[in-house]
């Protein structure tokens, strides 16, 4: 059938952060090329990454069309130089990916503390609302635009001189925390989607401490 030396892809894996979504697979091709197809449950398969020797395919453009749909991808293997060749079932060898629902599964990217401002015994901490590749009306939506109140942030903060951490939560991107006057504090933030069963939390933001350039201080 011409597929004697063609092997099916395996270990198909979704890698997705803030909806930037790449399908990866093995093996590195030897005398073969790959084409990827992706579909929702509609079965309207769309081909991407035609006859590639890569072992990854960026499917972001497809999944951002509706991040709440569930997607399946499949990777077809063809002999290099003979892409018309088919397997014994009359079609090229292929393997299916696991199902992937971006809204429920994309990893939350590492947040960034955009600014903090102290006014007396209060500190207002703002977490950057990161832009995603999800579009609406030709503009890119932020993480908050996409997830709404499903997304919360947790702030961990502590006196620079001690290790005991306190926490605060917000379903906006801003925290207002109580601090002791004249005492320096450090903090980091984490994005969380409490309703999820997987990939609930992001990695921690870089630690920021009062007295560094991001802060403003007012009596």
């Amino acid at each position: 059938s011409g597929t004697t030396n063609t092997v099916a892809a395996y270990n198909l894996t979704w890698k997705s952060t803030n909806f930037k979504t790449i399908l990866e697979w093995e093996p590195k091709p030897v005398n073969q090329v790959y084409t990827v197809q992706i579909s929702t449950k509609s079965g309207d398969w769309k081909s991407k990454c035609f006859y590639t020797t890569d072992t990854e395919c960026d499917l972001t453009d497809e999944i951002v069309k509706d991040v709440k749909q569930t997607y399946l991808a499949r990777v077809f293997s063809y002999p290099a130089g003979n892409v018309e060749s088919t397997g014994s079932a009359g079609e090229p060898l292929y393997e299916n990916s696991p199902e992937f629902t971006p809204y429920l599964e994309t990893n939350l990217g590492q947040p960034t503390i955009q600014s903090f401002e102290q006014v007396g015994t209060k500190v207002n901490v703002t977490v950057e609302d990161e832009r995603t590749l999800v579009r609406r009306n030709n503009t890119f939506l932020s993480l908050r635009d996409v997830f709404g109140k499903d997304l919360i942030y947790t702030l961990y903060y502590w006196k620079s001189s001690s290790s005991g951490k306190k926490t605060a939560k917000t379903n906006t991107n801003e925290f207002l925390i109580d601090v002791e006057k004249g005492v320096s504090y450090c903090f980091f933030a984490q994005a969380v989607i409490p309703s999820r069963t997987v990939n609930r939390k992001s990695t921690d933001s870089p630690v920021e401490c009062m007295g560094q350039e991001k802060g403003e201080f007012r009596e």
Epitope: K41, S42, G43, D44, L72, S88, A89, G90, E91, E95
Partner: antibody
């Protein structure tokens, strides 16, 4: 509740035609591939045809290729199977089914009976 | 086409028995297999997809296993409602069903 209701079955002579319909409710019809599966009296299940959510992709079993046409009207939430050049061996209960990705059937209708006989 | 062979074609069992049905594919289908239950005069009902994923609402006494060419459907403790015919279906290349296994009362 997801429901599928077939209609259009009946008695037809060999060489005749019949159009089956399947009315869907309880889910976003265009979001799913749909299919037809048949079962001859006292026999097992046989896949007949599948259509993608947009209607742009269709697949047929060799036994019906060129004689049967699957279609859908998403505005009416209805799936169709146009059966031409019918043969005695097409006699069966025809089931309509919701088919995620066009792969497996997670919801089935109750079926409609087609009898091809002179 | 990929052929699916089920065994046994008929199985006699009693309530409470552990029942195993086998399905073999003529070539590797990875895990792309579904199991259905059908009662006389009724439509089939999906039990298992992707070889081992239990469909929502299906009792946990049903389980599926296997990959490649050999698959099993297991009913851990047969209940009166389980006497029926069971079909496997591959969806690796188009769709084909096994011939069915009738589970009857011993």
């Amino acid at each position: 509740e997801v429901q599928l209701l077939e209609s259009g079955g009946g008695l037809v002579q060999p060489g005749g035609s019949l159009r089956l319909s399947c009315a869907a409710s309880g889910f976003t019809f265009s979001d799913y591939a749909m299919g037809w599966v048949r079962q001859a009296p006292g026999k097992g299940l046989e896949w007949v045809s599948t259509i993608s959510g947009s209607g742009g992709l269709t697949y047929y079993a060799d036994s019906v290729k060129g004689r049967f046409t699957i279609s859908r009207d998403n505005s009416k939430n209805t799936l169709y199977l146009q059966m031409n050049s019918l043969r005695a061996e097409d006699t069966a209960v025809y089931y309509c089914a919701k088919a995620p990705y066009g792969y497996y059937m997670d919801v089935w209708g109750k079926g409609t009976t087609v009898t091809v006989s002179s | 086409d990929i052929q699916m062979t089920q065994s046994p074609s008929t199985l006699s069992a009693s309530v409470g028995d552990r029942v195993t049905i086998t399905c073999r594919a003529s070539q590797s289908i990875s895990s792309w297999l579904a199991w259905y239950q059908q009662k006389p005069g009724k439509a089939p009902k999906l039990l298992i997809y992707k070889a081992s994923s239990l469909e929502s609402g299906v009792p946990s006494r049903f389980s599926g296993s296997g990959s490649g060419t050999e698959f099993t459907l297991t009913i851990s403790s047969l209940q009166p409602d389980d006497f029926a015919t069971y079909y496997c279906q591959q969806y690796k290349s188009y769709i084909t069903f096994g011939g069915g296994t009738k589970v009857e009362i011993k």
